[in-house]
């Protein structure tokens, strides 16, 4: 009966050698793809000279296969019932799933100019930077290939800086041959309701990026959740991509390849300003750009990015306040395409399908002492790209799942 099934499930979702969960956990059996859409700036000169609205045109998808590498340094700790690991990063370009090649060119914000002018706000240093920007013939915008933009390029301006700085710039640099973690998660041996929940990340229970509860590492990594998921639950998870924990709420029942799953979505409330959602007060880290914490839908993660003014949002500024998207023309947010969801099989807690969507933006501000930013009359949170990372259980795995799990129950 039900108790026997519960007992079997509890046994099989433990993260230890020999269980179904462990095998799929170490190396995902699902093919995961990350699609990128780049925001190609159509009017760079007008923006730089007249502080016009930035006209963007998205180009994509450019697709990469990701998360194909097995977890590394997997170490069980019998004493505290945890398992620690590193999640290696790797990306393989998929030409057949892309609209062009990695050599395609895009006009985008000059990442180094925007970041350096933000990090070094001292006027004397800005004057030094200005002379180097001019000397390197850099400008507010630049033309870069997809490969350069994502994975890194040697910046000509930074190469002239006479003190030690990283001269290679890229939105995901470094990526290949790096790893995320160390993660230490509960294996569920002593308490199945804690399985996959993160105990520590990089050796700490807090991130040191935020104040108060915002700094906590909550829940799992979203690949799975403790079994017997209820629709009333709020599912907490941590995403290193956005340097914070977040949550998903039940939206609807979905049938995925004959398997009944619960669709959990990231609600707009998670992106709201503290005015609407007081819990979010600690995600508001400064008063000027956020208009005294009244703006919403963008997350300043500069503290997590060595001071670089990176802002994370949903694609096309979905769920963001009008003031954020007002200086940008060409955005068309819609929930279906741009929200994040997780399809969770409720008995096992496994995420069988997901779509993680986010947008990477960079803040650029006027600067009295930097010529190429001198004519700007306002701050811009400039969209650089948005991504859609998806994974769906394969047909074979779905058959196995139906016969071994959902079939047995029904």
């Amino acid at each position: 009966g039900d108790l026997l099934i519960q007992k079997t499930i509890k046994k099989q979702v433990v993260l230890e050698e020999g269980t179904i969960a462990f095998k799929n956990w170490v190396k995902t059996g699902t093919e995961v793809y990350r699609q990128f859409w780049i925001f190609d700036v159509q009017n760079p000169q007008e923006v730089m000279m007249n502080s016009s609205n930035i006209q963007v045109k998205q180009r994509g998808p450019y697709t990469y296969r990701v998360r194909f590498l097995a977890k590394e340094n997997v170490t069980q700790d019998a004493e505290d019932n945890t398992v620690s690991f590193l999640q290696p990063n790797g990306a393989i370009f998929e030409p057949s799933l892309s609209v062009g090649t990695e050599a395609d060119n895009f006009t985008v914000l000059n990442l180094a100019v925007a970041a350096a002018s933000h990090i070094y706000q001292n006027q004397f240093v800005q004057m030094i930077l200005n002379s180097l920007i001019n000397k390197s013939k850099s400008s507010m915008f630049q033309v870069r290939t997809l490969r350069e933009l994502l994975w890194g390029y040697r910046d000509p301006f930074l190469s002239l800086v006479p003190y030690p700085v990283t001269t290679t710039v890229g939105l995901f640099y470094p990526y290949n041959n790096t790893a995320d973690g160390v993660y230490k998660v509960f294996n569920g041996k002593d308490n199945i309701s804690k399985v996959a929940i993160i105990d520590t990340y990089k050796g700490k229970r807090n991130l040191s990026y935020w104040e108060s509860h915002c700094d906590m590492i909550n829940g799992t990594d979203a690949a799975s959740f403790p079994p017997f998921v209820e629709k009333s639950q709020v599912l907490q998870f941590f995403s290193s991509d956005i340097c914070r924990s977040i949550y998903a709420v039940f939206e609807s029942d979905v049938n995925l390849k004959g398997i009944p799953v619960y669709r959990f979505v990231l609600p707009s409330k998670a992106f709201a300003s503290p005015v609407e959602n007081p819990d979010n007060y600690c995600f508001c880290t400064e008063k000027i750009i956020s208009k005294n914490c009244t703006s919403y839908g963008v997350l300043d993660i500069s503290k997590c990015k060595e001071g670089r003014p990176v802002y994370i949002s949903l694609p096309h500024f979905l769920y963001a306040s009008p003031d954020v998207s007002e200086p940008i023309d060409g955005l068309n947010p819609n929930e279906e395409e741009h929200r994040t969801y997780l399809d969770i099989e409720p008995i096992t807690g496994f995420t069988l399908q997901f779509a993680k969507r986010l947008q990477v933006n960079l803040l650029v501000k006027p600067s009295e002492k930097i010529q190429v930013l001198k004519n700007l009359k306002r701050n811009y949170i400039v969209p650089i790209l948005w991504l859609n990372e998806t994974g769906t259980i394969g047909d074979e795995k779905a058959n196995m799942f139906r016969s071994q799990v959902t079939g047995k129950i029904n």
Epitope: N122, F124, I128, Y163
Partner: antibody, heavy 118, light 107 residues
Framework: QIQLVQSGPELVKPGASVKISCETS????????MHWVKQSHGKSLEWIGG????????KYNQKFKGKATLTVDKSSSTAYMELRSLTSEDSAVYYC???????????WGQGTLVTVSA | ETTVTQSPASLSVATGEKVTIRCITS??????MNWYQQKPGEPPKLLIS???TLRPGVPSRFSSGGYGTDFVFTVENMLSEDVADYYC?????????FGAGTKLELK
Amino acid sequence: QIQLVQSGPELVKPGASVKISCETSGHTFTEYTMHWVKQSHGKSLEWIGGIYPNNGATKYNQKFKGKATLTVDKSSSTAYMELRSLTSEDSAVYYCARDRYDVWFAYWGQGTLVTVSA
Amino acid sequence: ETTVTQSPASLSVATGEKVTIRCITSTDIDDDMNWYQQKPGEPPKLLISEGNTLRPGVPSRFSSGGYGTDFVFTVENMLSEDVADYYCLQSDNLPLTFGAGTKLELK
């Protein structure tokens, strides 16, 4: 309050070097640029260069490149300027001056008189 | 390098009179001009910073104007304590450059 106290007068021989200090107090030393300014007797002011203690970024007036070297000691909140291969042309009062946010040369040291004479 | 031409080199003015000093720059520097006062045996003192901003504690008889390449510094009612050398400084670009100075004396 903010104070910049410079080392005393120097009498040096031609061809020698001299190192002038500027000890600061009353502010976060690393956050503000320290500049050095030359004033020859009865003449105008000349900007020698500046140093941002936070990251050690320096910029010199081309005219003083090779003549002046700017350094800082963060632990003692002190800025230094070394002048080398001195000639009578280098005889002058040298000031250190500190910025305040976006204000240039908001605070000044009392000046150090350097006399180059055989 | 932006050169700064300051005039006049010296000026003799009676108490209560208006004083005007001019600085012309070789390049457009927006409003990045600063004005300093230096009394004998003392370091210079900042009176007016970029954007024609009068510094706190500086008497309102001092003012400045100008944009681009032409700048004017004014003392509205000359007092004996205003006897000093006055310098303009452009802070638009490096190297920072001063004017040659104006010696202001009492008539």
